[in-house]
Interface confidence: medium
Amino acid sequence: DMKGHFDPAKCRYALGMQDRTIPDSDISVSSSWSDSTAARHSRLESSDGDGAWCPAGPVFPKEEEYLQVDLRRLHLVALVGTQGRHAGGLGKEFSRSYRLRYSRDGRRWMDWKDRWGQEVISGNEDPGGVVLKDLGPPMVARLVRFYPRADRVMSVCLRVELYGCLWRDGLLSYTAPVGQTMQLSEVMVHLNDSTYDGYTAGGLQYGGLGQLADGVVGLDDFRQSQELRVWPGYDYVGWSNQSFPTGYVEMEFEFDRLRTFQTMQVHCNNMHTLGARLPGGVECRFKRGPAMAWEGEPVRHALGGSLGDPRARAISVPLGGHVGRFLQCRFLFAGPWLLFSEISFISDVVNDSSDTFPPAPWWPPGPPPTNFSSLELEPRGQQPVAKAEGSPT
C-alpha cells in the first residue's frame, strides 16, 4: 500500500475550463480568426461568441497554431476533452486530430507522447460531440498547449477541458541512471524509464519525470504489466548490480519548493528467483538550493527484509522531518537487480518558503519564458468525472 501516493484512477477532476474557475486571463492562443473566436471562447460546452477558438490561419501544413491553458500550479493531467465549433448547430469546424505540448516552468516544453511514442491524438468527428482522451502516460504540467491538426488546408476550431488533480507531491524532476535490460531465458525484459520527459546523457536521465512518478505500481511478476500491448518489464525501471561497483544506485529528486520530508515510499519488485530484490538499505541527504552542499550526515534506513515473499511491495523510508528542496538517495543492492515502479514522498511545504516556483532551470534552454503572475495557494474548485474515453457526455 502506497500511503500518500496519488491514485491515478481518482485523479480525474475537471480542472476548470467549463466551469470557468480557470479565468480568461489564463487562456492564451497563438492567434485568433476574430474576437468572437478568441481564446476565451475555447471552453468545453461554451456557446459564447462564435462558439469556439479558431486560429487566424490554416493549421496545415505547419501545425504551429495553439491554445494554451495555464493551470497556475503543477497538476497531473490525466485526460483531455475536445469539441469543435457548435454555434447553435451552425458551426462546422472541428479538429480530427491534435497534438499536446506541456511545460512545468514555461521555459521548457515537452511533446506529449503515448506509451508507444505516438504524438498525434484522435480528435473530433463532428462539431458538437465531446471526445475524451485518456492520457497514458499522464503529464505533470502547469501549462498545456493544444495544437490542432488537419490533413489539408481547412478551418479548424476547438473547445477543450482538462481533467486531473493537483500535483501534491511537488516533485519537479528526478535524476537516475538509465534503466537496463535483463536477459531472461525466454524473454528480454526492458527495464528502462520509457516515459521519461527529461534529458539523457552519459548514462543519466535528468531534468524530467517518468514512470517512477506516474502512479502506476508494477505487478508482482515484473514480466507482466498493468498496461495492454507493452513489452515485458514495462512497469519497472531496473538496474543490475554488475553495472554499479559502488553497490548502490544513486538518484536525485528536485521539488517545487522547500519542504519538510516525512517519508519516501518506493514500490519495489522482490521476485528474487529472477534476481530482483528489495534494496538492502537506503541513504538520503538533503539540501535547500541547487548550489548548496548536501547537509550533514545522511538519513540511513536499513531494510534487510525477508527474501521469501516474492510479491512486489512499497517500502517506507522515514526521512525524519528533514528540510530541503533537493534529495539525493542511494539505494543499496541486496541482490543482482533493483527494480522500482514508483517513488513518492510524504512532505509538507515549509510555510515561509518564498521559493514557490523553481529558479532558472539547469537544463538546456527551450522557448522563451512565459510571464507568470503569482501562484494560487489553494486548488481550484474541482468536480469529479468518471467518464470512459470516448463516452458520451
Epitope: 531472461l184 531465458s185 525466454e186 505487478l219 508482482d220 511478476d221 507482466q224 521476485m271 528474487h272 528467483t273 529472477l274 534476481g275 525477508s306 527474501l307 521469501g308 515473499d309 516474492p310 510479491r311 512486489a312 541482490g335 543482482p336
Partner: antibody
C-alpha cells in the same frame, strides 16, 4: 511431459560429501527456477534452497548454508545439489522440484522421484 | 521463521464423509499451498494460492483461509484420498512446510 529424473540412492560415510543430480525434460530448463527439499524420517519437509538456471541466482535456507551447494549444467538441463561434511542428521530423502513462479506466485509444481541418502559408517 | 502447525496430525475417515484439516501459521501469511504425498512417492502440488486446485485434482477438494488460519476440505471422502497433506508458505524466509496431516 515435464519430468525430473533424480540420481539413485546413496550410502555415504560420515564426513564425506556427495552430489545429487536432477535431470529435467519436457520444458525449457532455463525458464524455471529449481528448488530442493529435504524429507527426514518420511515426514518433515524442509526447503533447502533454490537456483535459477538461466541467471545463476541462488537462495538458501539459512539452516542449509554451508551444507548444500546448488549448481546447474544448462547444456544437459541438469541441476545438482552437493551435500558437504555429511552426518547422520543428513540422512533423508532429497527432492528437486520445479518452481512455478508466473504471476509472482510460487509453488513447486513438479517433483523428482527423490534421492535417498543414508549416512552411516 | 514462520511455523506451520497442522491439525489433526492423524485422522481417519469413511468414504462419503466430509474431511476438514487446518494449518495454523505463527505469523500472518498471504497465501498457502497444499501438497499431497502418498507413501513411497513424491509430494504433488494439490492446492495452490490458498484455493486454486492443481491440474487433475478432483473438485471435491477445496482450500480457504487468510492471515494465520488456513484449511483444506474434502467434501466427500474417497479411498484414493488417503494420503498425507502438507501445507507450505512462501511469505517469509525460509519457506516452511507444516508437519503434515495423515489421512
Amino acid at each position: 511431459e515435464v519430468q525430473l529424473q533424480q540420481s539413485g540412492p546413496e550410502l555415504v560415510k560420515p564426513g564425506a560429501s556427495m552430489k545429487i543430480s536432477c535431470k529435467a525434460s519436457g520444458y525449457s530448463f532455463t525458464g524455471y527456477t529449481m528448488t530442493w527439499v529435504k524429507q527426514s524420517h518420511g515426514k518433515n519437509l524442509e526447503w533447502i534452497g533454490l537456483i535459477n538456471p538461466y541467471i545463476g541466482v541462488t537462495s538458501y535456507n539459512q539452516k542449509f548454508k554451508g551444507k548444500a551447494t546448488l549448481t546447474v549444467d544448462k547444456s544437459s538441463s541438469t541441476a545438482y545439489m552437493e551435500l558437504l561434511s555429511l552426518t547422520s542428521e543428513d540422512s533423508a530423502v532429497y527432492y528437486c522440484a520445479r518452481l512455478y513462479d508466473r504471476g509472482g506466485r510460487y509453488a513447486m509444481d513438479y517433483w523428482g522421484q527423490g534421492t535417498s541418502v543414508t549416512v552411516s559408517s | 521463521q514462520i511455523v506451520l502447525t497442522q491439525s489433526p496430525a492423524i485422522m481417519s475417515a469413511s468414504p462419503g464423509e466430509k474431511v476438514p484439516m487446518t494449518c495454523s501459521a505463527s505469523s500472518s501469511v498471504s497465501f498457502m499451498h497444499w501438497y499431497q504425498q502418498k507413501s513411497g512417492t513424491s509430494p504433488k502440488r494439490w492446492i495452490y494460492d490458498t484455493s486454486k486446485l492443481a491440474s487433475g485434482v478432483p473438485a471435491r477438494f477445496s482450500g480457504s483461509g487468510s492471515g494465520t488460519s488456513y484449511s483444506l476440505t474434502i467434501s466427500n471422502m474417497e479411498a484414493e484420498d488417503a494420503a498425507t497433506y502438507y501445507c507450505q508458505q512462501w511469505n517469509s524466509d525460509p519457506w516452511t512446510f507444516g508437519g503434515g496431516s495423515k489421512l
